[in-house]
């Protein structure tokens, strides 16, 4: 079976402050199952963005219907972007486990925010 | 609290038809996949099919394909199993579920009796 | 199919411990559902493996390892009394399934 993948083809996205942002990830397999979680940074003091299996976060929304059982497009968008969302994210698949096992990370999205038109 | 309550159930004659259905409240129902499953007297539960929060992606166990259609109004938050050309051996407590994000099942509706009986 | 024991008999007070197998590690999702009565609306107990909703009291927990979950229900209570189905969710074949169930009887 060909190794899971974990694509964001998108190097940079710049937006706009105030406006949305879309963050691209889709993953080659569903297999293993786990949840996949979008980080900004990296190493310990990575910020948490999204979950897929819990948690409340109101300015992101799934742009695919997660509850779909093929459901392979982990891509997410978010609202009301301020210059403080700058950064790189990363969308990361986890393996089931107790806890849930870090498998494979995107490249990384790098997000530039634009000053607000006048 | 999270409420699932299903109807339509009743005794039909081999052949017919019947429409099933659950009202869901307490959560926000168009988030959430719902899934239909049976328990034949004196036997254990059999999932028969399942449906995204959408509505667009169904899924249905091989038994059940092309004879049963679930389907959802997120308006109304409720959710529906069509049983075409009943057999004795549909004769269960038909349940609706609520999925979790992995399609597990959390809450349960207290289920509405089909007789299928000639 | 997933595979658990018809039965299981336990004393207040002991821990029960309730197997299900059947399940590639890999691609399944185990839960653990309690019903006490025939016909009666079923309670998941664990999800997601080892979850335990809000509402489930801290003796049940769950695991899962190589093809197997295991339900525990550490210091069991008459209450317990019920049938234990296991059910799996598969990632390949987008397809539910459930055990044949355990009767769980409280001496």
């Known amino acids: 079976e060909e190794e899971l993948q974990v694509i964001q083809p998108e190097k940079s996205v710049s937006v706009a402050a105030g406006e949305s942002a879309t963050l691209n990830c889709t993953a080659t397999s569903l297999i293993p199952v786990g949840p996949i979680q979008w980080f900004r940074g990296v190493g310990p003091g990575r910020e948490l963005i999204y979950h897929q299996k819990e948690g409340h976060f109101p300015r992101v929304t799934p742009v695919s219907d997660p509850t779909k059982r093929n459901n392979m497009d982990f891509s997410i968008r978010i609202s009301n972007i301020t210059p403080a969302d700058a950064g790189t994210y990363y969308c990361v698949k986890f393996r089931k486990g107790s806890p849930d096992v870090e498998l494979k990370s995107g490249a990384g999205t790098e997000l530039s925010v634009r000053a607000k038109p006048s | 609290d999270v409420q699932l309550v299903e109807s339509g159930g009743g005794v039909v004659r081999p052949g017919e038809s019947l429409r099933l259905s659950c009202a869901a409240s307490?959560?926000?129902?168009?988030?959430?996949?719902m899934s239909w499953v049976r328990q034949a007297p004196g036997k254990g539960l059999e999932w028969l099919a399942g449906?995204?929060?959408?509505?667009?992606?169904?899924y249905y166990i091989d038994s059940v394909k092309g004879r049963f259609t679930i389907s959802r109004d997120n308006s109304k938050s409720s959710l529906y199993l069509r049983m075409n050309s009943l057999t004795a051996e549909d004769t269960a407590v038909y349940y609706c579920?609520?999925?979790?994000?992995?399609?597990?099942?959390?809450?349960w509706g207290l289920g509405t009796l089909v007789t299928v009986s000639s | 199919a997933l595979t658990q024991p018809a039965s299981v008999s336990a004393n207040p007070g002991e821990t029960v411990k309730i197997t299900c197998s059947g399940g590639?590690?890999?691609?399944?999702?185990y839960a653990w559902y309690q019903q006490k009565s025939p016909g009666s609306a079923p309670v998941t107990v664990i999800?997601?493996?080892?979850e335990r909703p809000s509402d489930i009291p801290s003796r049940f927990s769950g695991s899962a390892s190589g093809s197997a979950a295991t339900l525990i229900i550490t210091g069991v209570r008459v209450e317990d009394e019920a049938v234990y189905f296991c059910?799996?969710?598969?990632?390949?074949?987008?397809?539910?399934?459930f055990g044949a169930g355990t009767t769980l009887t409280v001496l």
């Open positions: 059910g799996g969710y598969d990632g390949r074949t987008y397809i539910n399934t």
């Open positions: 999800h997601s493996d080892d």
């Open positions: 307490g959560f926000t129902f168009s988030s959430h996949a």
């Open positions: 590639d590690y890999y691609s399944t999702y």
């Open positions: 449906i995204s929060a959408g509505g667009s992606d169904t």
């Open positions: 579920a609520r999925e979790t994000w992995n399609h597990l099942f959390d809450y």
